[in-house]
């Protein structure tokens, strides 16, 4: 249930944040599931554990497989899992679809790269960026901390980008990539006031209570790229990732633009293994750029199992 | 904005059982432990015990053991705390409490007056 | 059990004096993750606690700066650098570092 996939390199470093979270939690331990085996604390061991943090340094192939952490504390204990895959290097620059990480958006205006998982490491500045495999060189390239900024941007800028940095343990050095697609928004248009297409505002959404429910929250923004544009959910007025519920994950949907022209954003709400509490919670799907911010609310309600039009996954 | 409302006020015979209730709201409830804390009038704070309710399990302190009994509703978000063979030191407010990531106590209930005579 | 003791158990002062309080703990409050379990909160007549610093030294959301606490692993000190009219409640040390949590007897901070 609380489990989360991670993938590296071999021979590059890899570090995984125990996906469980205790409230509160004072020591993490680790465990190779298959044997319920403690992975060791100590810097010497080429795999340890640090905390939240399961280091790799460096990985193996031989390294893929599932991991336990058990976030402990003096009242409770709670368990989570590390599915880990480590992959063997491409002899070619192909970047295989499995190794990459979520595709950005970027226009004239806005052409940062941000370097996927770079926060898990100890790592200095400058990073490394290339494109399809290419050192990024000219002035137009810039790397700042931990992303690429990219001064006009054309649509030939679009491409897959790696990262690549050094992390740094006890004076050891260890090499991490990171991939992800960078995609060009066309800058001609206008922008207008938010205007949400779904959910309707104060939608009453029903729910099975046990399986899983998907919420759209879409919104179009005007016509062409925008500056700023945004689709979010909040839960209770909190940010999903503040929430702080595995469960309940947003994911970026498809940018649209309709063939009126109009360009519009998604973000899917999923709910896996829906509770009862969630039923008590105010969803807002929030759209917002420049113009200001439109809120549309839903809220769950219990399905009755015998009725199979659904939106469940 | 989180918040945590108890149940109002109780007298009680001596021998009685009380159960004092805490709708809890603004966050999600199963992820963050629930305690109750007593406080006898012009004393000091005294934990009683905990929850987990995602899983139910319990801790409680010794001085309370096998008198308490604590309880959670993950439908409604509401964790429960029972006290039986009720005694006249056993007058004190009541307060439930919620948990964060870094620490315990983060968020408290107006509390709860229970008074026990006869 | 680890006791929580803390003195004075109460004092009296002004608005704009420097107020001190001291707790102690019978058994070490430093965890081998190197966190001290120490915690404060500030009490009013009928209101529930409100957390002040956890974990020794670290505000809570939204206290003041003038509340500070210091120590080592069983001696603590609560510090108000220039009381306020809100300042004036009880005061608890506690322990989280295992169970039962305990709390000290508190520390009526009253106005001279």
């Known amino acids: 249930k609380f489990s989360k996939q991670s993938w590296g390199l071999e021979n590059e470093a890899l570090i995984v944040r125990c996906p469980r979270q205790g409230k509160p939690s004072y020591t993490v331990d680790w465990y190779y599931s298959q044997t319920n085996k403690s992975i060791p604390t100590q810097e010497r061991n080429r795999v340890f554990a640090s905390g939240q943090l399961l280091k790799f340094l460096p990985a193996a192939v031989a390294d893929s497989g599932i991991y336990t952490c058990i976030v402990r504390s003096p009242t409770f204990n709670r368990t989570g899992y590390a599915n880990v895959t480590i992959y063997k290097k491409q002899s070619d620059c192909n970047v295989p679809d499995y190794l990459m990480y979520s595709t950005v958006s970027g226009s004239e205006k806005n052409s940062k790269i941000y370097c996927p998982t770079i926060d898990l490491y100890n790592w200095t500045a400058p990073l490394e960026w290339f494109k399809n495999c290419q050192a990024l060189q000219g002035s137009r390239y810039r790397a700042h901390k931990s992303f690429l900024v990219i001064d006009n941007v054309m649509t030939e800028d679009a491409g897959d980008y790696t990262c690549k940095f050094i992390h740094n343990e006890n004076g050891a050095n260890y090499s991490v990539t990171a991939t992800r697609s960078f995609t060009v928004k066309d800058e001609q248009g206008f922008s207008l006031f938010p205007v949400i297409g779904a959910p309707a505002q104060n939608e009453i959404k029903e729910v099975e209570i046990g399986k899983n429910a998907n919420l759209t929250c879409s919104a179009c923004f005007g016509k062409g790229t925008q500056f700023l544009a945004a689709v979010l959910w909040q839960l209770n007025g909190t940010k999903i990732t503040d929430f702080g519920e595995p469960r309940i994950q947003q994911e970026e949907g498809q940018n649209q633009s309709f063939s009126n022209g109009l360009a519009c954003l998604d973000m899917v709400l999923r709910i896996a293994d829906v509770k009862e509490e969630d039923l008590l919670l105010q969803y807002d799907c929030l759209a917002l750029n420049l113009h200001g911010l439109r809120r549309h609310t839903v809220r769950l309600s219990r399905k009755n199992p015998i009725d199979h039009h659904s939106i469940y996954c | 904005e989180v918040q945590l409302v108890q149940s109002g006020a109780e007298v009680k015979k001596p021998g009685a059982t009380v159960k004092i209730s805490c709708k809890a709201s603004?966050?999600?409830?199963?992820?963050?432990?629930m305690h109750w804390v007593q406080q006898a009038p012009g004393k000091g704070l005294e934990w009683m015990g905990a929850?987990?309710?995602?899983?139910?399990?319990?801790v409680y302190a010794e001085k309370f053991q096998g008198r308490v009994t604590i309880t959670a509703d993950k439908s409604s978000s509401t964790a429960y705390m029972e006290l039986s063979s009720l005694r006249s030191e056993d007058t004190a407010v009541y307060y439930c409490?919620?948990?964060?990531?870094?620490?315990?106590?983060?968020?408290w209930g107006q509390g709860t007056l229970v008074t026990v005579s006869s | 059990d680890i006791q929580m003791t803390q003195s004075p158990s109460s004092l009296s002062a002004s608005v704009g004096d420097r107020v001190t309080i001291t707790c102690r703990s019978s058994?070490?409050?430093?965890?081998?993750?190197?966190?001290?379990?120490l915690y404060w909160y500030q009490q009013k007549p009928g209101k529930a606690p409100k957390l002040l610093i956890y974990?020794?030294?670290n505000l809570a959301s939204g206290v003041p700066s003038r509340f500070s606490s210091s120590g080592s692993g069983t001696d603590f000190t609560l510090t108000i650098s220039s009381l306020q009219p809100e300042d004036f409640a009880t005061y608890y040390c506690?322990?989280?570092?295992?169970?039962?949590?305990?709390f000290g007897q508190g520390t009526k901070v009253e106005i001279k």
């Open positions: 409490t919620g948990s964060t990531t870094d620490y315990y106590f983060a968020y």
């Open positions: 603004g966050y999600i409830f199963i992820d963050s432990e």
């Open positions: 929850i987990d309710p995602e899983t139910g399990d319990t």
């Open positions: 058994k070490s409050l430093l965890h081998s993750n190197g966190i001290i379990y």
């Open positions: 974990q020794l030294s």
């Open positions: 506690a322990q989280n570092l295992e169970l039962p949590f305990t």
